[in-house]
């Protein structure tokens, strides 16, 4: 007996699509071996029509696909635009066609619905609108027009031209009588419900000379699109419901048991707590379409999602909807990275951001997730030398360590920095990482003076005190600029006296600026690192002023001013504002400066937001 399982019989009608799921034992060999769909011939052979290795027969070109779901031990064959020629016996299988690891499927395609016994068939999607046309003869032009629905053996009046509307159709039905030239009346039903399906009869006149017309209304639930994404990855649901609902509240919900659909996010400001920090609902286009991005996919995110439109912002009978079945692949290509990074007020964090290593040349971005309204993620920094004005001197995006990871360092932390941040690139849109920064009680490990003033032409020495816990780390000073932090020579001055209960392994490392010039003004960081992995940093702003008295300046901790919370920028600074991911396919930019950089198609990264992995301020 074959271990492959599937539907023995599939029945459909012309023009329709089928989605055939074949189940196999998900052993390692089975998951990775060839999957195929073939048609059995009269003489016993089986001719491949489509396979997982990319082969598609000319008979299936443009209308079929085969998707393997190794985590579930299933593969799905979708075939569209069916014709009666597609009727026959097929096999779905693994490996080589003739080798018995297969399952027999009988597909029968019958003639499509049309005019059957003078019955017009209307096939309409759930939530949409149908117009039932009812012709009549001249002698019934002035007579009552009506539409009935067959309920069991009895016709029940739905609407008539005297103003009656059945309560089940209140607010969503109308009867239109065409101008005198046309002998036709129409009944328009919107917000179609599944319960609206059935046999209808329209009638003009009430006597034996009345004109009657039968109609069969089929209300279709949308076939869910199968979506397969990696654990810790990202998914985008593109929802196009049509211009007729452009001004109606939109929602994305996840089906729980039975018919319940729990709102994940909607345009009325509702968001499920499980998606805090990892979801964006992108502003809708004029045609009413919108998209929802979810990052940091978890195992429990798998399931059926519906997007729709309804004034309540949630699924109701008659909402037009689109559906997806999301599978989350646990054999993820996306590495684990910390979901929480902790820092102390005045201290720093170093965040590691994964990206697709095949796309090392992609532009890297970091943005701050904001939950207000539908969620947005204004950019803070990118790898091309742009830093948001308010973050000058305390934020840097470094390409190190490379090979699939970049680093973002944020220092001078305040409680306002707590929140969710996204790592992005303009390359592979599946790689979006979400990390939460938490500000905890404690003191910064590195001690530096606050703002320092240097004198033109003189020498300035700035101390940085490293506690003994960093004895094995490389210690450095660098000068911050938009593109990173350029390393500077520094001197180890021996053990530091700035720490209580700290042995000889503490260190005082000084930065010396000889013959200070105006160009030396700016932000300086001292920090620790291990190879290409960065740890804590501390920042000092060095101002340069004219000479008042001779001599060099040696700055101590006691003399230093407190570091300012906000730095006032000189008026010449080019401020770039409102650089936000309002649509993850396009970074919305409002800049005074022309910027032709490729803003690319999505920028996804990911994080396992469900894990309890945490990362302290020192990164490693």
């Amino acid at each position: 007996k074959s271990p492959i399982f599937g539907p023995e019989e599939v029945n459909s009608v012309e023009g329709n699509s089928v989605s055939i799921t074949c189940y196999y034992p998900p052993t390692s060999v089975n998951r990775h071996t060839r999957k195929y769909w073939c048609r059995q011939g009269a003489r016993g052979g089986c001719i491949t029509l489509i396979s997982s290795e990319g082969y598609v027969s000319s008979k299936y070109a443009g209308r079929a696909n085969l998707t393997n779901f190794p985590e579930n031990g299933t593969f799905v064959v979708n075939i569209a635009q069916l014709s009666q020629d597609d009727s026959g016996r097929y096999k779905c299988g693994l490996g080589i066609n003739s080798r018995g690891l297969s399952f027999d499927v009988s597909l029968e395609v019958s003639q499509g619905p049309g005019l059957l016994n003078d019955t017009k068939v209307y096939t309409v999607d759930l939530g949409r609108t149908v117009t039932i046309n009812c012709p009549f003869k001249t002698e019934n032009a002035q007579k009552r027009k009506s539409l009935y629905k067959q309920i069991g053996l009895y016709p029940v009046l739905v609407i008539d031209s005297s103003g009656y509307v059945n309560p089940n159709y209140t607010g969503r039905i109308r009867l239109d009588i065409q101008g005198t030239g046309q002998l036709l009346f129409s009944v328009v039903i919107n917000q179609l419900r599944l319960s609206d399906a059935g046999q209808y009869l329209c009638q003009a006149g009430d006597d034996s000379n009345s004109n009657k017309k039968n109609a069969d209304l089929q209300v279709l639930k949308p076939e869910p699109e199968l979506v397969y994404e990696d654990l810790r990855g990202s998914v985008t649901f593109h929802c196009a419901l049509g211009p007729e609902v452009a001004n109606v509240a939109k929602f994305l919900c996840r089906q729980s048991s039975g018919e319940n659909c729990d709102v994940v996010v909607n345009t009325l400001g509702k968001r499920a707590p499980a998606f805090e920090g990892r979801i964006l609902l992108n502003p809708q286009d004029k045609d009413g379409s919108f998209s929802v991005v979810i990052t940091g996919l978890r195992k429990e995110d798998a399931g059926r999602y519906l997007c729709g439109a309804h004034s309540d912002g949630q699924l109701q009978e008659g909402s037009p909807i689109q559906a997806w079945q999301l599978f989350v692949n646990e054999e993820s290509t996306i590495p684990r990275s910390p979901t929480v990074v902790k820092g102390v007020a005045g201290g720093s964090v170093a965040v590691l951001c994964p990206y697709n290593r095949k796309e090392s040349k992609s532009i890297k971005y970091w943005c701050l997730w904001e939950g207000a309204q539908n969620g947005r993620c204004p950019l803070l920094v990118d790898s091309e030398g742009w830093v948001k004005a308010q973050y000058e001197g305390r934020l840097s995006l470094l390409e190190e360590p490379g090979n699939g990871t970049f680093t973002v360092i944020l220092n001078q932390l305040t409680s306002r920095d707590a929140g969710f941040y996204w790592c992005l690139t303009n390359g592979d849109t599946l790689w979006r990482t979400t990390v939460e920064i938490k500000i905890i009680e404690g003191e910064p490990n590195l001690k530096v003076p606050g703002n320092v003033t240097a004198v033109l032409g003189e020498t300035l020495k700035v101390p940085c005190h490293f506690p003994c816990k960093f004895s094995s780390y490389e210690k450095y000073w660098c000068k911050w600029n938009n593109t990173g932090c350029q390393a500077l020579p520094s001197q180890d001055e021996g053990p530091s006296k700035a720490f209580v209960n700290c042995d000889e392994n503490s260190r005082l490392v000084s930065l010396t600026l000889n013959l200070v010039t105006r160009a030396d003004e700016g932000w300086y960081w001292c920090g620790v690192k291990q190879g290409h992995f960065y740890g804590e940093t501390a920042a000092v702003y060095v101002a340069v002023e004219e000479r008042k008295a001779a001599g060099s300046r040696d700055v101590s901790l006691a003399k230093a001013d407190a570091a300012p919370d906000e730095k006032v920028l000189d008026s010449g600074f080019r401020e770039i504002e409102n650089k936000a991911i309002q649509d993850p396919r396009l970074f919305a930019e409002e800049k005074a400066v022309a910027d032709t950089r490729d803003q690319a198609d999505g920028s996804r990264a990911s994080v396992d937001s469900g894990s309890s992995e945490e990362q302290g301020g020192s990164s490693r």
């Epitope: 599939v10 459909s12 699509s17 639930k221 076939e223 059926r304």
Partner: nanobody
Amino acid sequence: EVQLVESGGGLVQAGDSLRLSCAASGRTGSSGAMGWFRQGPGKEREFVAALMWRNTVTYKYYEDSVKGRFTISRDNAKNTAYLQMNSLKPEDTAVYYCAADPDTYGDPRNSGAYDYWGQGTLVTVSS
């Protein structure tokens, strides 16, 4: 809430036929699934047959031991599923349960894929 009521069970001779019915109250809608499971004396509940429908497409699934003998069908208008059982064997003796789900995309053999269950009807096949 969907309620399921099975009927048609009884005592028959080996080789005879029976037709089980499963009537669903409430709306089953334009997509969903109805399945038949059985539990023989001292055995685990096992899959027998299932019918899934997606709008105008239907998919029929059978357990190997019943292929060619049992046929699953559905009357859309009556909201009823049927299991036509021919060439019955003593090993078919069991309580037969009907299961339904308004919108399943799981493995139809998996009892966890169904939200609603009937109370069962007993089929006894004597030799």
